[in-house]
Interface confidence: low
C-alpha cells in the first residue's frame, strides 16, 4: 500500500484557493468504513476522516470554514484537501496519512506568495515649496524595497516606511514617498521589489497639469 503525490510543492497566491492531493490504491468499490484519512500541517489537525465521517471537532481553528476533504474524490482514490482563501500562515509542510488495508503517508509543501500587486498612488503639491509629493502604497509579503525611477531612467531617492498590515498580521504595508520638483506630463514609476523574489510590481504616476482657479483663467 503506497500513497503517491502528483506534486510535493504547491506555490499559491495569498487569498487564492488550493487543492493538495494524495493518491491511494482503490480496488473496485471504495469501502468508506475501513478508510482513514488524516491531513495535518505541522502540529495542526485539519482533517480526521474515520468510519465514513469527518470529525469537525478536531479541526484547528485557523482552518475553520476554509478546509475540507473532497469526499467525491475519495472514490477515485484521491484524498484531496481543499483550502480556500489561503493565508500566509497556511504556508508549511502538510502531511496526508491514509490507512486502507495498509498505511502510508506523504508530505507536501505549501508556499504562499503575496505580491505587491495592488499599488495605490497619489500625487499632491506642496503649496509652499511647489514640490510634488508622489506616494505609492501596497501590501504584500515578504518585505519589499521601493525603487523610484523617471521616464528618462533616472533612479530617484524616495522615503519608504514598512508597517504591519491591519488586514493580516504577517502582511507588510509598504509606503514610499518621493518629493521632487517637476513639471506637468512627466512620468514616474514606483517599483515594489520583494526581497528574494524576481517578480516586481510597478505603478506609473503621471504628473497632472497644474490646477488653475477658473476665475483666474478668465483674467488671462
Amino acid at each position: 500500500f503506497t500513497i503517491t503525490v502528483s506534486k510535493d510543492l504547491y506555490v499559491v497566491e495569498y487569498g487564492s484557493n488550493v487543492t493538495l492531493e494524495c493518491r491511494f490504491p482503490v480496488d473496485k468499490q471504495l469501502n468508506l468504513l475501513v478508510l482513514v484519512v488524516y491531513w495535518e500541517m505541522e502540529d495542526k489537525k485539519i482533517i480526521q476522516f474515520v468510519n465514513g465521517k469527518e470529525d469537525p471537532n478536531v479541526q484547528h481553528s485557523s482552518y475553520h470554514g476554509r478546509a475540507q476533504l473532497l469526499k467525491d474524490q475519495l472514490f477515485l482514490g484521491k484524498a484531496a484537501l481543499q483550502i480556500t482563501d489561503v493565508k500566509l500562515q497556511d504556508a508549511g509542510v502538510y502531511c496526508c496519512l491514509i490507512s486502507y488495508g495498509g498505511a502510508d503517508y506523504k508530505r507536501i509543501t505549501l508556499k504562499v506568495n503575496a505580491p505587491y500587486r495592488k499599488i495605490y498612488h497619489t500625487i499632491s503639491v506642496d503649496p509652499v515649496t511647489s514640490e510634488h509629493e508622489l506616494t505609492c502604497q501596497a501590501e504584500g509579503y515578504p518585505e519589499a524595497d521601493v525603487i523610484w525611477t523617471s521616464s528618462d531612467h533616472q533612479v530617484l531617492s524616495g522615503k519608504t516606511s514598512i508597517t504591519s498590515s491591519k488586514r493580516e498580521e504577517k502582511l507588510f504595508n509598504v509606503t514610499s514617498t518621493l518629493r521632487i520638483n517637476t513639471t506637468a506630463d512627466k512620468i514616474f514609476y514606483c517599483t515594489f521589489r520583494r526581497l528574494g523574489h524576481e517578480e516586481n510590481n510597478t505603478a506609473e504616476l503621471v504628473i497632472p497639469e497644474p490646477y488653475l482657479d477658473p476665475a483666474k483663467k478668465r483674467n488671462h
Epitope: V5, K7, D8, Y38, L97, A103, Y105
Partner: antibody, heavy 118, light 113 residues
C-alpha cells in the same frame, strides 16, 4: 533543541522479550514519524518500521513483522519498540530516528545495545 | 526489496584530498511525479549515531559543510568529499526511501592513510 534519549543496554535470554524506549524532546512529538533502525556489527543499517504517535499508525518492514511491535505514549512523548522471541540474530544496536519534512531520518537517538545470550 | 550496493567498501585518504564514494540501487530511485531521487547519505563515526548529510540525492542537510556534495540520479549516485578533514573519518551509508521497506547500503569506511 531536538533530542531523542534511548533507554540503556539490555542483556536478555533467548526466547524472551525486551522493550526499549525513546524519549523525545524539543519538538512536537505527535506530528513527526518515529522510525526504528537496526544495526549489527558489519551488517550496516536495517529499517524496521515507523509509528505515527498522534494516531498510533504503524508500518513495518515485513522482515520484522511479528518480531517488532511499535507503540507510543503521547503523554510522555516516548516511543517504544518491543522485540519478542529473541534469538542471537536479534543482538544489535537499535536506533530510533525522527523524520522531518523531507522523509529523511534527521534526528537519531544514541542507540540501545541489545545482547541476547544464555 | 530494493538492493543498495556501495563501493569501495573502504578507502584510505590523506587530509586535504578529495574522495568519491559510490552508491548503486537495483532499481531507479527517481520518483517521476516530482522528479526527485529518494536517496539519502548518512555519516557514522565510531561509537556514534548516524548523522544525515544529504537528502533527495543532492540536497545538503542544515549545518552540513559544503565540502560534502551529493550527485547522481536514477540508479547511480555519488558522494564527493572535497578536501577531506580528519573529522570526516567515518562510515558512510546511502539509503533509499522511495519504496518500502526503506533499505541502506552496506557502507563505505573512510580511513586515514
Amino acid at each position: 533543541q531536538v533530542q531523542l534519549q534511548q533507554s540503556g543496554a539490555e542483556l536478555v535470554k533467548p526466547g524472551s522479550s525486551v522493550k526499549i524506549s525513546c524519549k523525545a524532546s524539543g519538538y512536537t512529538f505527535t506530528s513527526n514519524f518515529m522510525h526504528w533502525v537496526k544495526q549489527q556489527p558489519g551488517n550496516g543499517l536495517e529499517w524496521i518500521g515507523w509509528i505515527y504517535p498522534e494516531y498510533g499508525n504503524t508500518k513495518y518492514n515485513q522482515k520484522f513483522d511479528g518480531k517488532a511491535t511499535l507503540t507510543a505514549d503521547k503523554s510522555s512523548s516516548t516511543a517504544y519498540m518491543q522485540l519478542s522471541s529473541l534469538t542471537s540474530e536479534d543482538s544489535a544496536v537499535y536506533f530510533c530516528a525522527s523524520e522531518e519534512a523531507v522523509i529523511s531520518l534527521v534526528y537519531w537517538g544514541q542507540g540501545t545495545l541489545v545482547t541476547v545470550s544464555s | 526489496d530494493i538492493a543498495i550496493t556501495q563501493s569501495p567498501s573502504s578507502v584510505a585518504v590523506s587530509v586535504g584530498e578529495t574522495v568519491t564514494l559510490s552508491c548503486k540501487s537495483s532499481q531507479s530511485l527517481l520518483y517521476s511525479e516530482n522528479q526527485k531521487d529518494y536517496l539519502g547519505w548518512y555519516q557514522q563515526k565510531p561509537g556514534q549515531t548516524p548523522k544525515p548529510l544529504i537528502y533527495w540525492a543532492t540536497n545538503r542537510h542544515t549545518g552540513v559543510p559544503d565540502r560534502f556534495t551529493g550527485s547522481g540520479s536514477g540508479t547511480d549516485f555519488t558522494l564527493i568529499i572535497s578536501s577531506v578533514q580528519a573529522e570526516d573519518l567515518a562510515d558512510y551509508y546511502c539509503g533509499q526511501y522511495l519504496v518500502y521497506p526503506f533499505t541502506f547500503g552496506p557502507g563505505t569506511k573512510l580511513e586515514l592513510k
